[in-house]
Structure formats: structure tokens, C-alpha cells
């Protein structure tokens, strides 16, 4: 039951996560006009990935794309590329993990082949969200960069009589939405993969109990032929310790609800 | 479209006024507004922005902690409260539309304001 | 603040002539974001409010004769009239619509011979 838990909040926690990174790779505003300390324009300028716009105080707003690929700096093409492959590996790992989910039964998949898919998605997910965190701070980071670039050299112009002033970007909302989805698609991915250690079957069908004789190192199974060939009591098979004979307690699975669809 | 200003008048130095402006033919909440003024003789002078929402505001300096700006959507009019009025307060006073590029596309008549004892 | 200054501060012309008047900012009123240059032109006759003639430097206001044409960039701009006629007769203030405050020019006034 809690492996199912686990499972299904990661599935639902990378969900969100990755609606967000797609929803962050399309904002517009990764980077937004900085207003403070700046001359009061009657413009608001704001860039995204793909395009850059500017809002009048008419309410008029224009957005042009980028419809160069060479002429585009190296890092927004790699921030670009790093978004991309964040939502690519993110599809990928809910479609794997749709069908690894305990709850949903396809023909006669068996634990090993969920538990396999299930952690496949969980490291599918934790790439796509340091992919998106990743992208995310390079762009930051580039941001920064260019404040303070901007900053120290606010005006530009000849001899100081005509001057330019330089717009100064800060960070847009889609930073923060980009951070967060990309946190929480890295968090589904570590439930995903603390589910799969829940769902994957031991190696053996029975129960292992150890008989340790002094001065000999025999271990005795009991349950004979039955035991040895897997027919018998639907217990699992236990890790076999040293020193004296003991057994985990039994986790038995039983059919419920949640196992059908 | 159409903006017709009102409220303007002799007013003595110190004193108050209200002027409005009312706006019809368009969609007035969907736009902002200006108020610029001009002294008998002289050039135009900007005063005030609005923004159809009313916020945010802007103000020329000589007329900022003076001079309020605001406005009633519902009925489409625009306001221009004066306090503290001085001598080179002595202007006409228009509205104008808000439009692309941030330009003024239409004006009102203009109001006149003469601040004198 | 946005100074805006008008050269010359009048024009006496004759029917048919062509005219330029200019405008020099001190800042550039040029956006980077969608390069266009915020500046407007307007007309304004006597006992009349002023009229708008051309918006981002260049974008004739509909309904305004193509005789009109504005060009420029940065902080110098102009204004031309190619074939002037009779009700050009006014007076053209440009206006800085980049900064606030809003700025307007001392004005050129046009006047026939």
C-alpha cells in the first residue's frame, strides 16, 4: 500500500513538475525589465526563449520572434537545449511510468517489470529536473551577468551630451516557475525510485531460516522439495544471516482494490 | 470619439479646482488617458498620465504633490484635481487619449484655467 | 528630464516647397526591445487642439496626408512635408512618449511668404 502511495504521488508530483517546465519554456517573461532605480519608461520590455515583447502603457504589447538560430548567443541556445531535453525525458518518464504504476494492471507484466520501469521513469524524471533546474540558472546566471554589466556602465554616448540608456533585465517569472517544476520533477523522480526498491521481488520463493552448528558452517533449509521448487506457501524468500538461526518477519501480498482498474 | 473638458475657470492663487473630462465613442476603461496643458502663448506642456486602470500614474514634476489624477471608468470621466494653484498654473487644459507608441491620438477642446487674485 | 529641442523655431516657406524641420533629444528614445523610436509629431493651429501627425518616429496616424513623412532614430529626427500647402500652416512640436515626464519641443512654426 505505501509503495503504491509513493508511486502514484511520484507519478503526480512529476506531472506537475513537468507541466511546469513545458509551461516555463514557453513564458515569455524570463527576463523582465528591471523598474528599479532605472529612468521611468513608458515601455515594459520582457524576453522569453523564443521571443521578446514589449508592453506600451497603451496597453499595446508586441512580440517578436527570434528567427535567427545562428545569430542567438550560445547560452540561450543551451538553455534552450537543456529545457528541450528536460521535457523530452519528462514525457518519456510518464509514459514509462504510467505503465510501471502498481495500481494499473496490463496483461501479465510481472513486479520485476514494473519495479524495472518504475525506477527507469525515477531516473528519468531526476535527469529532466536537473535539466530544467540547470537551464534555468544558466539563464539566471547570464542575467546577472549582464545587470551587472549594464549597471556599470549605465549610460552610453559621446562625450556624455547624448546618452543611451541601457535596459537592465532582471528575473522574470518563469525563472521561478522553471525552479520549482524543476524541484519537484527531481522529487517525483526520488519517489519513483524509492518505490521501484518497494516493488522489485526477492531472487528466491521461500523462506530462508539458518541453523548455524557450532564449529560447522552447515546451514539447513528446511521445506525439502516444495521449497526448493517454489510451490507451496506464497511467502518470500529471506535473506539468510549469520549467527544463530532467525527470519524476518513475513510480508505477505495480498489481492486488494487498488491492484485492479 | 469624443473628450469635452469642464470645470475650468478664474481661481485665486492657493486655491482649488476640479476638472473633468468626459469621454464618449469608445471603449474609455480600455485606455489610458493624458492631461497636458498649454500657457497662452507657449508651447505644450505635459501633466499627467493615467493608466486605464489607474495604475499606474504619472506626474510632470512641476505639478507632482499638486496636481491628482484619476478617474471613474463607470462613467466614463476623467478628473484632474489642482490644489495649491499658482500663476504659471494659468493654462488651457486638455485630455487626450493614450495610443499606440505612447502617443496622444485625440484631444478635447481644452478648458481654461486662470489663476489670478 | 527629456530635453527636446526644435530647429528652427520657425519656417517661412511658399506653397509647393518641400520642408524639413528637426528635433534633437538628449536621450535616445530608441527601444532595444522592439527597436522603435518613441517619439511622436503633432500639428496644432491656432484656437485648435494639436493633432497627431506621426507616432514611433515614422507610423503615419491614419486619415494624415502622405505628404507627412517622418524619419530618424536615436535622438535627431525629422519631419518633412514634401509638397507644402496652405492648411499646413501651423505650428509642430515633437514629444518624447519614451521617458516620463513626457516632454514636449519648443516647437517650429510654419509660415508662408
Known amino acids: 500500500m505505501a509503495v503504491t502511495a509513493c508511486q502514484g504521488l511520484g507519478f503526480v508530483v512529476s506531472l506537475i513538475g513537468i507541466a511546469g517546465i513545458i509551461a516555463a519554456t514557453c513564458m515569455d517573461q524570463w527576463s523582465t525589465q528591471d523598474l528599479y532605480n532605472n529612468p521611468v519608461t513608458a515601455v515594459f520590455n520582457y524576453q522569453g526563449l523564443w521571443r521578446s515583447c514589449v508592453r506600451e502603457s497603451s496597453g499595446f504589447t508586441e512580440c517578436r520572434g527570434y528567427f535567427t538560430l545562428l545569430g542567438l548567443p550560445a547560452m540561450l541556445q543551451a538553455v534552450r537545449a537543456l529545457m528541450i531535453v528536460g521535457i523530452v525525458l519528462g514525457a518519456i518518464g510518464l509514459l514509462v511510468s504510467i505503465f510501471a504504476l502498481k495500481c494499473i494492471r496490463i496483461g501479465s507484466m510481472e513486479d520485476s517489470a514494473k519495479a524495472n520501469m518504475t525506477l527507469t521513469s525515477g531516473i528519468m524524471f531526476i535527469v529532466s529536473g536537473l535539466c530544467a533546474i540547470a537551464g534555468v540558472s544558466v539563464f539566471a546566471n547570464m542575467l546577472v551577468t549582464n545587470f551587472w554589466m549594464s549597471t556599470a556602465n549605465m549610460y552610453t554616448g559621446m562625450g556624455g551630451m547624448v546618452q543611451t540608456v541601457q535596459t537592465r533585465y532582471t528575473f522574470g517569472a518563469a525563472l521561478f516557475v522553471g525552479w520549482v517544476a524543476g524541484g519537484l520533477t527531481l522529487i517525483g523522480g526520488v519517489m519513483m525510485c524509492i518505490a521501484c526498491r518497494g516493488l522489485a521481488p526477492e531472487e528466491t520463493n521461500y523462506k530462508a531460516v539458518s541453523y548455524h552448528a557450532s564449529g560447522h558452517s552447515v546451514a539447513y533449509k528446511p521445506g525439502g522439495f516444495k521449497a526448493s521448487t517454489g510451490f507451496g506457501s506464497n511467502t518470500k524468500n529471506k535473506k539468510i544471516y549469520d549467527g544463530g538461526a532467525r527470519t524476518e518477519d513475513e510480508v505477505q501480498s495480498y489481492p486488494s482494490k487498488h491492484d485492479y482498474v | 470619439v469624443q473628450l469635452q473638458e469642464s470645470g475650468g475657470g478664474l481661481v485665486q492663487p492657493g486655491g482649488s479646482r476640479k476638472l473633468s473630462c468626459a469621454a464618449s465613442?469608445?471603449?474609455?476603461?480600455?485606455?489610458?488617458m493624458h492631461w497636458v496643458r498649454q500657457a497662452p502663448e507657449k508651447g505644450l506642456e505635459w501633466v499627467a498620465f493615467?493608466?486605464?486602470?489607474?495604475?499606474?500614474?504619472y506626474y510632470a514634476d512641476t505639478v507632482k504633490g499638486r496636481f491628482t489624477v484619476s478617474r471613474d471608468n463607470p462613467k466614463n470621466t476623467l478628473f484632474l484635481q489642482m490644489t495649491s494653484l499658482r500663476s504659471e498654473d494659468t493654462a488651457m487644459y486638455f485630455c487626450?487619449?493614450?495610443?499606440?507608441?505612447?502617443?496622444?491620438?485625440?484631444w478635447g477642446q481644452g478648458s481654461s484655467v486662470t489663476v489670478s487674485s | 528630464d527629456i530635453m527636446m529641442t526644435q530647429s528652427p523655431l520657425s519656417l517661412t516657406v511658399t506653397a509647393g516647397e518641400k520642408v524639413t524641420m528637426n528635433c534633437k533629444s538628449s536621450?535616445?528614445?530608441?527601444?532595444?526591445?522592439?527597436?522603435?523610436?518613441?517619439l511622436a509629431w503633432y500639428q496644432q493651429k491656432p484656437g485648435q487642439p494639436p493633432k497627431l501627425l506621426i507616432y514611433?518616429?515614422?507610423t503615419r496616424e491614419s486619415g494624415v496626408p502622405a505628404r507627412f513623412t517622418g524619419s530618424g532614430s536615436g535622438t535627431d529626427f525629422t519631419l518633412t512635408i514634401n509638397t507644402v500647402q496652405a492648411e499646413d500652416l501651423a505650428v509642430y512640436y515633437c514629444?518624447?512618449?519614451?521617458?516620463?515626464?513626457?516632454?514636449f519641443g519648443t516647437g517650429t512654426k510654419l509660415e508662408l511668404k
Open positions: 514611433w518616429a515614422s
Open positions: 487626450a487619449r493614450n495610443y499606440y507608441g505612447n502617443a496622444m491620438d485625440y
Open positions: 536621450q535616445s528614445l530608441l527601444n532595444g526591445g522592439n527597436q522603435k523610436n518613441y
Open positions: 465613442g469608445f471603449s474609455f476603461s480600455s485606455f489610458g
Open positions: 514629444q518624447n512618449d519614451y521617458f516620463y515626464p513626457l516632454t
Open positions: 493615467i493608466s486605464s486602470g489607474s495604475s499606474p500614474i
